[in-house]
Interface confidence: low
């Protein structure tokens, strides 16, 4: 290889060893018959070499340095070239540099062809291995913009006071042009401006000069985007850190079109805007820091660009102001996306301020509209309390658990809706009563309706799930004794048409001392499943739930215990079942410890099936599933 | 990538209440799993506190009675431990983790942990 | 609550070499719904304990097959196939069949 480097060129080339620090074993640079680790070849010098070994692209490397000096001449603008050529230089990883000096008046303006430039962060890496790194100049010290790979959206970097541009190929890269061109600007009279241009859909993440490090003191950064007027833009801020300030405010300003309050001023910490139509500016101020304890300002950003999707002209009112105790959150459910660009999905506040989740709160009116693709990818949570804990005037009052219709005219899928039912300690209980009988899900008859309701007694340190319950069954009743949840959950798109003709109604009635009654009306048809609360994890110690089953008149009612034995060892106290008719008062009482569980029984009348606890002992837990059958009486044995 | 990151102060004086935040994301703490506080004494003893499920659960190690409670907020996608009486015994490194509590059955994820001294 | 006896304390190895722990509990870890919730942790110096062996013998996804579990009776051991050096910390087995979940006192892993 020959390279020759013109005087006054001002490109000087260094052909290095990747890892100085490690030894070469055979691979030397062959030059006038020395053999050397390095090679520099400056303006005006011709140097003719070879490498003592076939591969030398894992051994060395070639950067190539350009000084361009706008201080004593003009500038030369225009289209910059590759010098050396990619066919006069050895086949090596090369990095140029061109090193751009220029007074602090001038602005200089750095234009990339297509493909643009695309953004990385630390860490990060281009898949063709061809990297641009741009750094400028305040006063003697050096500040990165940016590190960047192609196809992007960033087409132009302003800045002031000079440049240095890095331009990484990696050996094999057939790349021969340089991509960019300069130009002369007036001054900026900031720190750089980055211009990204959308033609289309599609995302850009951005970052601070010298990221992840800290941007420099009252310094002053904007960013240009150029967004087709049929898109809508919308700002997150991935990553960020505040230094401590001095004087003045570090935050971020928005410039947008047809903005009646322009510049728009927002903090770090604050919402940022969403649904912004064309093009906007966003501007990041540094402060004067606090000199003993700096701190570091930082962020990183992302804009995302997207259709407006038919609902974002559509504005929903969420009516919470006559709620003290409701919250409704939207937010994504949780599922991972296979395609390459996924548009944002924002749920957005008063139609500017957008986020991935929002949740309402009570007392107020809430304007909401969407920006999202898909809105199936959202959906609802929503919590109420019902605190119901002067016994002396609640005693005796109903109240109807039904979603709101505000609620269910949104467009987003209802998931949750949650009920916390509080109630005075040993004073009162609570009484469900559904529109629809319910049926109790297991595994044996698993529901398969488009909603249920999961019910649970909320007390601090027992965790008691009474079970998942839904519409078409034979429960009649469910009495709970102390502060419970009641959870609508939905499971099928269509729940709407069902959940507006059942009504869940909660009763507040006189104290109990079981844990839970449930009363339950067979019907004919179907066997009725049922199993004890905290199925899987055992009944709570010392406690008792009984069935309360009506058994018609023209019928008769077969139990059946699922297990032969119920699998209980106590630790302390005893644990039984009681079996009894409710007519004639006879009653069955069986151990559930050393005893085999009843065999299948018949009853003529309606009876009770009562089980109480011991303190069972680790893993010997009681839990208990029966069915019950109704055959029609063929003699009546009254 | 679900990553569990827990906050709060590094001493307490005895009968104090120690209060911890588990910050989740990466996961929506309302969608699935059991949000667990497990700690490590020094010698490296490790003891279960308790947890709040995806679903509002509790349940709590008996060892610790009364004085544990764990909330959580949604809206931060946060969850928390409050352990009240806190002795010099309550020094210890304390782990936020997340247990799938249907699947594996396991304790999948675990926060870095955050050390925890009670002096006064 | 269920104590879990894990041995060795100590189990010193060269690398290359099968480790074998042990981890006994007095009462049975079946849950009632069927599954033993016996789970096998590893923790190295300054970090979070990682999920290794869950429900006695399935491998936790990116965990590699040297690991393996196993059960007899009330008995559940881990075994490492050939010891690698990032194998080395302190092992732990812990029960979350019932309440409260416990944890084994811990085997150190470390080379002779």
């Known amino acids: 290889s020959e390279i020759a480097l013109p005087r006054g060129s001002d490109i000087t080339v260094h052909i290095k060893l990747v890892s100085p620090a490690l030894p070469v074993k055979f691979c030397y640079i062959v030059v006038s018959r020395q053999h050397v680790t390095e090679l520099t070849i400056r303006p005006g010098e011709r140097k003719s070499f070879t490498f003592s070994c076939n591969n030398p692209e894992k051994h060395y490397v070639l950067k190539i340095e350009k000084n361009i000096d706008c201080m004593s001449g003009p500038c030369p603008f225009g289209e910059v070239r590759l010098q050396p050529s990619k066919s006069e230089l050895p086949i090596l990883n090369r990095t140029y540099i061109w090193d751009v000096r220029a007074h602090k008046s001038i602005g200089l303006e750095l234009q990339f062809a297509t493909p643009r430039l695309r953004q990385i962060g630390p860490g990060e890496s281009c898949a063709d291995g061809v990297t641009h790194s741009i750094s400028g100049h305040i006063d003697a010290t050096e500040v990165r913009i940016g590190t960047f790979c192609s196809n992007g959206t960033v087409s132009r970097i302003k800045m002031q006071e000079g440049v240095k541009m890095a331009l990484h190929l990696p050996w094999f890269h057939p790349r021969n042009i340089s991509g960019f061109s300069i130009a002369n600007r007036s001054s900026i009279k900031r720190l750089c401006i980055i211009e990204s241009v959308f033609e289309g859909e599609g995302s850009a993440t951005l970052m601070s000069a010298n990221y992840p490090g800290g941007f420099p003191e009252d310094e002053l950064m904007t960013w240009q985007f150029v967004v087709p007027a049929h898109l809508r833009a919308s700002v997150s801020f991935l990553n960020f850190n505040v230094s401590n300030c001095e004087r003045k405010e570090e935050r971020v300003e928005y410039y947008i079109p047809g903005s009646t309050t322009n510049p728009e001023v927002f903090r770090l910490e604050d919402q940022q805007p969403g649904n912004m139509a064309g093009n906007f500016n966003l501007s990041l101020q540094g402060c004067d820091q606090d000199a003993q304890s700096p701190g570091i300002l930082r962020l990183q950003f992302q804009v995302l660009v997207q259709r407006p999707q038919n609902e974002s002209n559509i504005t929903y009112m969420v009516d919470l102001s006559q709620e003290r105790t409701m919250s409704l959150t939207i937010e994504p459910r949780p599922v991972k996306h296979g395609r390459r660009f996924v548009p944002g999905c924002f749920v957005c506040l008063d139609s500017r301020t957008c986020s991935t989740n929002v949740t309402l709160t009570a007392g107020s009116k809430h304007k909401i509209s969407f920006l999202c693709d898909d809105l199936a990818r959202l959906w609802m949570n929503v919590e109420k309390t019902l605190s119901c804990l002067d016994h002396r005037y609640y005693y005796g009052k109903s109240f109807n658990l039904q979603v709101p219709k505000d609620i269910l005219q949104l467009p987003v899928q209802l998931h949750d809706f949650s009920w916390k039912l509080l109630v005075p300690k040993d004073r009162l209980g609570l009484m469900l009563v559904p529109g629809q009988k319910l049926q109790q899900h297991t595994r044996e008859r698993p529901c398969n309706t488009s909603f249920g309701y999961q019910v649970a007694s909320t007390t601090p340190g027992q965790d008691l799930y009474f079970g998942s319950f839904c519409p078409g069954g034979s429960i009649e009743k469910i009495q709970v004794k102390q502060n419970s949840s009641v959870t609508l959950r939905t499971y099928a798109p269509g729940f709407q048409q069902e959940v507006s003709k059942q009504v869940l109604t909660v009763s507040l009635i006189p104290y109990f001392k079981e844990e839970g009654i449930f009363t339950v009306t067979p019907d004919s048809k179907n066997k009725v499943y049922l199993r004890s609360p905290n199925w899987d994890r055992g009944l709570p110690a010392l406690s008792s739930v009984s069935w309360n089953i009506s058994v018609p008149s023209n019928q008769v009612a077969c139990l059946t215990f699922f297990r032969e034995r119920s699998g209980l060892a106590c630790q302390s106290g005893r644990a039984f079942m009681i079996i009894q008719e409710q007519q004639t008062r006879a009653e069955e009482i069986f151990s559930l410890e050393e005893e085999v569980l009843p065999k299948p029984s018949f009853h003529h009348h309606s009876f009770w099936v009562n089980i109480s606890n011991c303190s069972p002992m680790n893993g010997k837990q009681l839990d208990l599933l029966f069915w019950v059958t109704l055959t029609p009486r063929t003699v009546d044995l009254t | 990538e679900v990553k569990l990151v827990e906050s709060g102060p590094g001493l307490v004086k005895p009968s104090q209440s120690l209060s911890l935040t588990c910050t989740v994301t990466g996961y929506s703490i309302t969608s699935d799993y059991a949000w667990n506080w497990i700690r490590q004494f020094p010698g490296n003893k490790l003891e279960w506190m308790g947890y709040i499920s995806y679903n509002t659960y509790t349940s709590y190690n008996p060892s610790l009675k009364s004085r544990i409670s764990v909330t959580r907020d949604t809206s931060k996608n946060q969850f928390f431990l409050q352990l009240k009486s806190v002795t010099i015994e309550d020094t210890a490194t304390y782990f936020c983790?997340?247990?799938?509590?249907?699947?594996?059955?396991?304790?999948?994820?675990w926060g870095q942990g955050t050390t925890v001294t009670v002096s006064s | 609550e269920i104590v879990l006896t894990q041995s060795p304390l100590s189990l010193p190895v060269s690398l290359g070499d099968q480790a074998s722990i042990s981890c006994r509990s007095r009462q049975t870890l079946v849950h009632t719904n069927g599954n033993t919730y016996l789970d096998w942790y590893l923790q190295k110096p300054g970090q979070s304990p990682k999920l290794l062996i869950y429900?006695?013998?399935i491998r936790f996804s990116g965990v590699p097959d040297r690991f393996s579990g196993s059960r007899s009776g009330t008995d559940f051991t881990l075994k490492i196939s050939r010891v690698e050096a990032e194998d080395l910390g302190i092992y732990y087995c812990f029960q979350g069949s019932h309440v409260p979940w416990t944890f084994g006192g811990g085997t150190k892993l470390e080379i002779k």
């Open positions: 983790a997340g247990g799938d509590y249907y699947g594996t059955g396991a304790v999948d994820y």
């Open positions: 429900k006695v013998s």
